[in-house]
Interface confidence: medium
Amino acid sequence: AILGRSETQECLFFNANWEKDRTNQTGVEPCYGDKDKRRHCFATWKNISGSIEIVKQGCWLDDINCYDRTDCVEKKDSPEVYFCCCEGNMCNEKFSYFPEMEVTQPTSNPVTPKPPYYN
Protein backbone atom coordinates (compact mmCIF):
# COMPACT_ATOMS: atom_id res chain seq x y z
CA ALA A 1 0.00 0.00 0.00
CA ILE A 2 1.11 3.56 -0.67
CA LEU A 3 1.99 5.39 2.54
CA GLY A 4 -0.86 7.58 3.76
CA ARG A 5 -3.37 5.98 1.45
CA SER A 6 -6.18 3.74 2.63
CA GLU A 7 -6.57 0.74 0.36
CA THR A 8 -10.17 -0.16 -0.45
CA GLN A 9 -10.68 -3.89 -0.79
CA GLU A 10 -14.36 -4.23 -0.02
CA CYS A 11 -17.41 -2.03 0.38
CA LEU A 12 -20.93 -2.29 1.66
CA PHE A 13 -23.17 -3.23 -1.26
CA PHE A 14 -26.82 -2.28 -1.65
CA ASN A 15 -29.11 -1.92 -4.63
CA ALA A 16 -32.65 -0.66 -4.12
CA ASN A 17 -33.39 -1.68 -7.71
CA TRP A 18 -32.03 -5.19 -7.17
CA GLU A 19 -34.96 -7.06 -8.71
CA LYS A 20 -34.87 -5.10 -11.97
CA ASP A 21 -31.07 -5.03 -12.11
CA ARG A 22 -30.89 -8.73 -11.14
CA THR A 23 -28.33 -8.34 -8.37
CA ASN A 24 -28.15 -9.07 -4.68
CA GLN A 25 -30.02 -6.53 -2.58
CA THR A 26 -27.38 -6.17 0.08
CA GLY A 27 -24.04 -7.60 1.13
CA VAL A 28 -20.32 -6.97 1.03
CA GLU A 29 -18.77 -6.31 -2.37
CA PRO A 30 -15.12 -7.14 -3.12
CA CYS A 31 -13.59 -4.34 -5.18
CA TYR A 32 -11.75 -5.48 -8.30
CA GLY A 33 -9.76 -3.37 -10.70
CA ASP A 34 -6.48 -2.88 -12.46
CA LYS A 35 -3.51 -2.93 -10.11
CA ASP A 36 -2.49 0.61 -11.03
CA LYS A 37 -5.93 1.99 -10.29
CA ARG A 38 -7.31 3.18 -6.97
CA ARG A 39 -10.60 1.79 -5.73
CA HIS A 40 -13.27 3.48 -3.69
CA CYS A 41 -16.60 2.91 -2.00
CA PHE A 42 -19.65 5.02 -2.78
CA ALA A 43 -23.22 5.65 -1.76
CA THR A 44 -26.10 7.24 -3.64
CA TRP A 45 -29.36 8.20 -2.00
CA LYS A 46 -32.43 10.40 -2.27
CA ASN A 47 -34.08 12.63 0.29
CA ILE A 48 -37.83 12.21 -0.12
CA SER A 49 -39.57 14.70 2.15
CA GLY A 50 -36.93 14.25 4.81
CA SER A 51 -36.83 10.47 4.50
CA ILE A 52 -33.54 8.97 3.31
CA GLU A 53 -33.92 6.38 0.54
CA ILE A 54 -30.71 4.55 -0.37
CA VAL A 55 -30.31 3.99 -4.11
CA LYS A 56 -27.00 2.14 -4.36
CA GLN A 57 -23.86 1.43 -2.41
CA GLY A 58 -20.78 -0.46 -3.50
CA CYS A 59 -17.36 -0.19 -5.11
CA TRP A 60 -16.46 2.77 -7.29
CA LEU A 61 -13.74 3.03 -9.90
CA ASP A 62 -10.61 5.15 -9.72
CA ASP A 63 -11.98 8.68 -9.42
CA ILE A 64 -9.94 11.72 -8.45
CA ASN A 65 -12.99 13.15 -6.70
CA CYS A 66 -12.72 10.33 -4.16
CA TYR A 67 -9.00 10.50 -3.42
CA ASP A 68 -7.98 10.64 0.25
CA ARG A 69 -11.56 10.91 1.48
CA THR A 70 -11.94 8.79 4.58
CA ASP A 71 -15.58 9.79 5.03
CA CYS A 72 -18.39 9.55 2.51
CA VAL A 73 -19.74 13.11 2.27
CA GLU A 74 -21.92 14.78 -0.39
CA LYS A 75 -21.08 18.47 -0.72
CA LYS A 76 -23.21 19.52 -3.68
CA ASP A 77 -26.11 21.78 -2.86
CA SER A 78 -29.47 19.95 -3.00
CA PRO A 79 -28.85 17.42 -5.78
CA GLU A 80 -31.76 15.26 -6.87
CA VAL A 81 -29.67 12.16 -6.22
CA TYR A 82 -26.98 12.47 -3.57
CA PHE A 83 -23.59 10.87 -4.20
CA CYS A 84 -20.50 10.41 -2.08
CA CYS A 85 -17.37 8.30 -2.30
CA CYS A 86 -14.49 7.47 -0.02
CA GLU A 87 -11.37 5.32 0.43
CA GLY A 88 -11.07 2.56 2.99
CA ASN A 89 -12.78 -0.74 3.61
CA MET A 90 -16.53 -0.34 4.19
CA CYS A 91 -16.14 3.43 4.40
CA ASN A 92 -19.59 3.79 2.77
CA GLU A 93 -21.39 2.25 5.75
CA LYS A 94 -22.07 5.80 6.90
CA PHE A 95 -22.60 8.78 4.65
CA SER A 96 -23.56 12.39 5.15
CA TYR A 97 -24.55 15.61 3.47
CA PHE A 98 -22.65 18.82 4.22
CA PRO A 99 -23.27 21.29 1.37
CA GLU A 100 -20.29 23.52 0.68
CA MET A 101 -22.50 26.57 0.27
CA GLU A 102 -23.42 26.53 3.95
CA VAL A 103 -21.48 29.05 5.97
CA THR A 104 -23.10 28.21 9.30
CA GLN A 105 -22.50 25.07 11.30
CA PRO A 106 -24.02 22.19 9.31
CA THR A 107 -27.03 20.63 10.94
CA SER A 108 -27.11 17.41 8.96
CA ASN A 109 -26.02 14.33 10.82
CA PRO A 110 -24.27 11.37 9.25
CA VAL A 111 -26.79 8.92 7.87
CA THR A 112 -26.35 5.52 9.45
CA PRO A 113 -28.21 2.85 7.48
CA LYS A 114 -30.54 0.75 9.60
CA PRO A 115 -32.19 -2.65 9.17
CA PRO A 116 -33.80 -4.18 7.24
CA TYR A 117 -31.41 -2.94 4.54
CA TYR A 118 -28.15 -2.97 6.45
CA ASN A 119 -27.57 -5.46 9.19
Epitope: F13, N17, C59, F83
Partner: antibody, heavy 120, light 107 residues
Protein backbone atom coordinates in the same frame (compact mmCIF):
# COMPACT_ATOMS: atom_id res chain seq x y z
CA UNK B 1 -3.12 -7.04 -21.95
CA UNK B 2 -6.89 -7.39 -21.81
CA UNK B 3 -8.28 -9.07 -24.91
CA UNK B 4 -11.82 -10.03 -25.91
CA UNK B 5 -12.38 -12.01 -29.09
CA UNK B 6 -15.89 -12.65 -30.39
CA UNK B 7 -16.82 -15.44 -32.78
CA UNK B 8 -19.88 -17.28 -34.04
CA UNK B 9 -21.49 -14.60 -36.19
CA UNK B 10 -22.76 -15.22 -39.70
CA UNK B 11 -25.79 -15.34 -41.96
CA UNK B 12 -28.93 -16.93 -40.57
CA UNK B 13 -32.54 -17.06 -41.71
CA UNK B 14 -35.35 -15.43 -39.72
CA UNK B 15 -36.45 -17.75 -36.94
CA UNK B 16 -33.04 -19.38 -36.82
CA UNK B 17 -30.47 -19.60 -34.04
CA UNK B 18 -26.84 -18.65 -33.46
CA UNK B 19 -24.48 -18.93 -30.54
CA UNK B 20 -21.88 -16.23 -30.10
CA UNK B 21 -18.74 -16.73 -28.04
CA UNK B 22 -16.32 -14.26 -26.51
CA UNK B 23 -12.91 -15.55 -25.44
CA UNK B 24 -11.32 -13.43 -22.73
CA UNK B 25 -7.67 -13.17 -21.74
CA UNK B 26 -5.32 -10.89 -19.87
CA UNK B 27 -7.45 -10.45 -16.76
CA UNK B 28 -9.13 -12.44 -13.99
CA UNK B 29 -12.29 -13.29 -15.92
CA UNK B 30 -14.24 -14.60 -12.95
CA UNK B 31 -13.94 -11.27 -11.11
CA UNK B 32 -15.83 -9.19 -13.68
CA UNK B 33 -19.31 -8.85 -15.05
CA UNK B 34 -19.63 -9.10 -18.83
CA UNK B 35 -21.95 -7.53 -21.38
CA UNK B 36 -23.15 -7.89 -24.94
CA UNK B 37 -23.76 -4.68 -26.89
CA UNK B 38 -24.87 -4.54 -30.51
CA UNK B 39 -24.79 -2.01 -33.32
CA UNK B 40 -27.05 -2.25 -36.35
CA UNK B 41 -25.48 -1.11 -39.64
CA UNK B 42 -25.15 2.67 -39.63
CA UNK B 43 -26.87 2.97 -36.24
CA UNK B 44 -25.91 3.62 -32.63
CA UNK B 45 -25.05 1.31 -29.75
CA UNK B 46 -27.68 -0.83 -28.03
CA UNK B 47 -27.03 -2.77 -24.83
CA UNK B 48 -28.27 -6.35 -25.14
CA UNK B 49 -27.46 -8.30 -22.00
CA UNK B 50 -25.17 -8.67 -19.01
CA UNK B 51 -24.13 -11.32 -16.53
CA UNK B 52 -22.44 -10.96 -13.17
CA UNK B 53 -19.09 -12.45 -12.22
CA UNK B 54 -20.35 -15.93 -11.33
CA UNK B 55 -23.34 -16.22 -13.64
CA UNK B 56 -25.82 -15.89 -10.80
CA UNK B 57 -27.52 -12.81 -12.20
CA UNK B 58 -28.39 -11.85 -15.76
CA UNK B 59 -30.14 -8.93 -17.41
CA UNK B 60 -31.64 -8.40 -20.86
CA UNK B 61 -32.96 -5.61 -23.03
CA UNK B 62 -36.70 -5.89 -23.60
CA UNK B 63 -36.05 -6.33 -27.33
CA UNK B 64 -34.30 -9.69 -26.76
CA UNK B 65 -35.90 -10.96 -23.55
CA UNK B 66 -37.13 -14.53 -23.92
CA UNK B 67 -35.16 -15.08 -27.12
CA UNK B 68 -31.53 -14.55 -26.08
CA UNK B 69 -29.66 -16.22 -23.23
CA UNK B 70 -26.36 -15.02 -21.82
CA UNK B 71 -24.04 -17.42 -20.01
CA UNK B 72 -20.41 -17.81 -19.08
CA UNK B 73 -17.91 -20.59 -18.44
CA UNK B 74 -15.32 -19.22 -16.02
CA UNK B 75 -13.18 -22.35 -16.37
CA UNK B 76 -12.81 -21.52 -20.08
CA UNK B 77 -12.73 -17.72 -19.71
CA UNK B 78 -15.56 -17.54 -22.20
CA UNK B 79 -18.80 -15.59 -22.48
CA UNK B 80 -21.71 -16.80 -24.61
CA UNK B 81 -24.87 -15.42 -26.18
CA UNK B 82 -27.41 -17.95 -27.39
CA UNK B 83 -29.72 -16.24 -29.86
CA UNK B 84 -32.98 -17.94 -30.83
CA UNK B 85 -35.99 -16.87 -32.92
CA UNK B 86 -33.82 -14.38 -34.75
CA UNK B 87 -35.44 -11.47 -36.55
CA UNK B 88 -34.25 -9.12 -39.29
CA UNK B 89 -33.93 -6.35 -36.70
CA UNK B 90 -31.33 -8.42 -34.82
CA UNK B 91 -28.90 -7.83 -37.69
CA UNK B 92 -25.94 -6.06 -36.15
CA UNK B 93 -22.33 -6.25 -35.08
CA UNK B 94 -22.29 -7.84 -31.62
CA UNK B 95 -19.60 -6.75 -29.17
CA UNK B 96 -18.71 -8.30 -25.86
CA UNK B 97 -17.55 -5.80 -23.27
CA UNK B 98 -16.18 -6.05 -19.75
CA UNK B 99 -17.98 -4.35 -16.92
CA UNK B 100 -15.40 -2.17 -15.23
CA UNK B 101 -16.51 -3.35 -11.83
CA UNK B 102 -19.10 -5.67 -10.36
CA UNK B 103 -22.13 -3.53 -11.11
CA UNK B 104 -21.14 -2.14 -14.47
CA UNK B 105 -20.30 1.48 -13.93
CA UNK B 106 -18.57 1.49 -17.31
CA UNK B 107 -17.65 -0.88 -20.13
CA UNK B 108 -13.89 -0.55 -20.12
CA UNK B 109 -12.75 -3.13 -22.69
CA UNK B 110 -14.50 -4.23 -25.87
CA UNK B 111 -13.95 -6.97 -28.41
CA UNK B 112 -13.67 -6.27 -32.11
CA UNK B 113 -17.21 -7.50 -32.78
CA UNK B 114 -18.83 -10.24 -34.82
CA UNK B 115 -21.43 -9.58 -37.52
CA UNK B 116 -24.80 -11.30 -37.35
CA UNK B 117 -26.96 -11.02 -40.46
CA UNK B 118 -30.57 -12.23 -40.32
CA UNK B 119 -31.98 -12.49 -43.81
CA UNK B 120 -33.86 -14.90 -46.02
CA UNK C 1 -36.03 3.15 -19.25
CA UNK C 2 -33.74 6.15 -18.98
CA UNK C 3 -33.45 8.00 -22.28
CA UNK C 4 -30.13 9.61 -23.22
CA UNK C 5 -30.24 12.50 -25.69
CA UNK C 6 -27.07 13.78 -27.33
CA UNK C 7 -26.57 17.00 -29.20
CA UNK C 8 -25.57 17.82 -31.78
CA UNK C 9 -25.94 14.63 -33.81
CA UNK C 10 -23.02 15.76 -35.96
CA UNK C 11 -20.62 18.66 -36.15
CA UNK C 12 -17.83 19.86 -38.40
CA UNK C 13 -14.66 21.19 -36.83
CA UNK C 14 -11.04 21.91 -37.63
CA UNK C 15 -7.86 20.67 -36.02
CA UNK C 16 -7.18 22.82 -32.96
CA UNK C 17 -10.83 23.69 -32.37
CA UNK C 18 -12.49 23.34 -28.98
CA UNK C 19 -15.39 20.91 -29.28
CA UNK C 20 -18.27 20.45 -26.86
CA UNK C 21 -20.82 17.63 -26.95
CA UNK C 22 -23.78 17.53 -24.59
CA UNK C 23 -25.78 14.63 -23.21
CA UNK C 24 -29.06 14.86 -21.32
CA UNK C 25 -30.65 12.07 -19.27
CA UNK C 26 -34.43 11.78 -18.91
CA UNK C 27 -33.98 11.56 -15.13
CA UNK C 28 -31.20 12.19 -12.66
CA UNK C 29 -28.40 9.65 -12.97
CA UNK C 30 -26.03 11.15 -10.39
CA UNK C 31 -22.47 10.33 -11.59
CA UNK C 32 -23.34 7.21 -13.58
CA UNK C 33 -22.33 8.70 -16.92
CA UNK C 34 -19.66 7.41 -19.31
CA UNK C 35 -18.37 8.54 -22.71
CA UNK C 36 -17.09 6.37 -25.56
CA UNK C 37 -15.27 7.07 -28.80
CA UNK C 38 -15.84 4.94 -31.89
CA UNK C 39 -14.00 5.11 -35.19
CA UNK C 40 -15.42 3.58 -38.40
CA UNK C 41 -15.14 -0.21 -38.45
CA UNK C 42 -13.74 -0.31 -34.93
CA UNK C 43 -15.11 -1.17 -31.49
CA UNK C 44 -16.05 1.61 -29.10
CA UNK C 45 -13.37 2.72 -26.65
CA UNK C 46 -14.06 3.99 -23.14
CA UNK C 47 -12.96 7.63 -22.85
CA UNK C 48 -14.43 8.91 -19.60
CA UNK C 49 -16.23 7.18 -16.75
CA UNK C 50 -18.06 8.53 -13.71
CA UNK C 51 -18.57 11.89 -15.49
CA UNK C 52 -15.01 13.19 -15.10
CA UNK C 53 -12.49 10.35 -14.84
CA UNK C 54 -10.25 9.67 -17.84
CA UNK C 55 -9.87 6.03 -18.80
CA UNK C 56 -6.37 4.59 -19.12
CA UNK C 57 -4.35 6.09 -21.95
CA UNK C 58 -6.84 8.83 -22.82
CA UNK C 59 -5.19 12.21 -23.54
CA UNK C 60 -5.85 15.09 -21.15
CA UNK C 61 -7.42 17.19 -23.90
CA UNK C 62 -10.59 15.17 -23.21
CA UNK C 63 -12.63 16.19 -20.20
CA UNK C 64 -16.09 15.60 -18.83
CA UNK C 65 -18.38 17.57 -16.57
CA UNK C 66 -21.92 17.72 -15.26
CA UNK C 67 -24.14 15.95 -12.78
CA UNK C 68 -27.76 14.92 -12.42
CA UNK C 69 -29.24 15.14 -15.91
CA UNK C 70 -26.89 17.35 -17.93
CA UNK C 71 -23.40 16.35 -18.99
CA UNK C 72 -20.70 17.62 -21.31
CA UNK C 73 -17.74 16.10 -23.13
CA UNK C 74 -15.12 18.65 -24.15
CA UNK C 75 -12.14 18.24 -26.44
CA UNK C 76 -9.94 21.24 -25.71
CA UNK C 77 -7.92 21.13 -28.93
CA UNK C 78 -9.17 18.76 -31.61
CA UNK C 79 -6.51 16.47 -33.10
CA UNK C 80 -6.68 14.54 -36.39
CA UNK C 81 -7.17 11.25 -34.52
CA UNK C 82 -10.21 12.66 -32.67
CA UNK C 83 -12.49 12.62 -35.71
CA UNK C 84 -14.93 9.89 -34.70
CA UNK C 85 -18.37 9.28 -33.23
CA UNK C 86 -18.90 9.86 -29.51
CA UNK C 87 -21.53 8.19 -27.35
CA UNK C 88 -22.68 8.87 -23.80
CA UNK C 89 -24.05 6.02 -21.68
CA UNK C 90 -25.81 5.78 -18.34
CA UNK C 91 -25.27 2.98 -15.88
CA UNK C 92 -27.55 4.28 -13.14
CA UNK C 93 -30.02 1.49 -13.74
CA UNK C 94 -30.76 -1.41 -16.03
CA UNK C 95 -31.14 -1.41 -18.96
CA UNK C 96 -27.91 0.43 -19.72
CA UNK C 97 -28.73 3.02 -22.37
CA UNK C 98 -26.65 5.01 -24.83
CA UNK C 99 -27.11 8.37 -26.46
CA UNK C 100 -27.66 8.44 -30.21
CA UNK C 101 -24.09 9.52 -30.90
CA UNK C 102 -22.33 12.64 -32.12
CA UNK C 103 -20.25 12.39 -35.27
CA UNK C 104 -17.28 14.78 -35.32
CA UNK C 105 -16.23 15.42 -38.91
CA UNK C 106 -13.45 17.40 -40.54
CA UNK C 107 -14.50 20.86 -41.70
Amino acid sequence: EVQLLESGGGLVQPGGSLRLSCAASGFTFDSYSMNWVRQAPGKGLEWVSNINYNGGYTGYADSVKGRFTISRDNSKNTLYLQMNSLRAEDTAVYYCARGANWHDTALDYWGQGTLVTVSS
Amino acid sequence: DIQMTQSPSSLSASVGDRVTITCRASQSISRYLNWYQQKPGKAPKLLIYAVTSLASGVPSRFSGSGSGTDFTLTISSLQPEDFATYYCQQSYESPLTFGGGTKVEIK
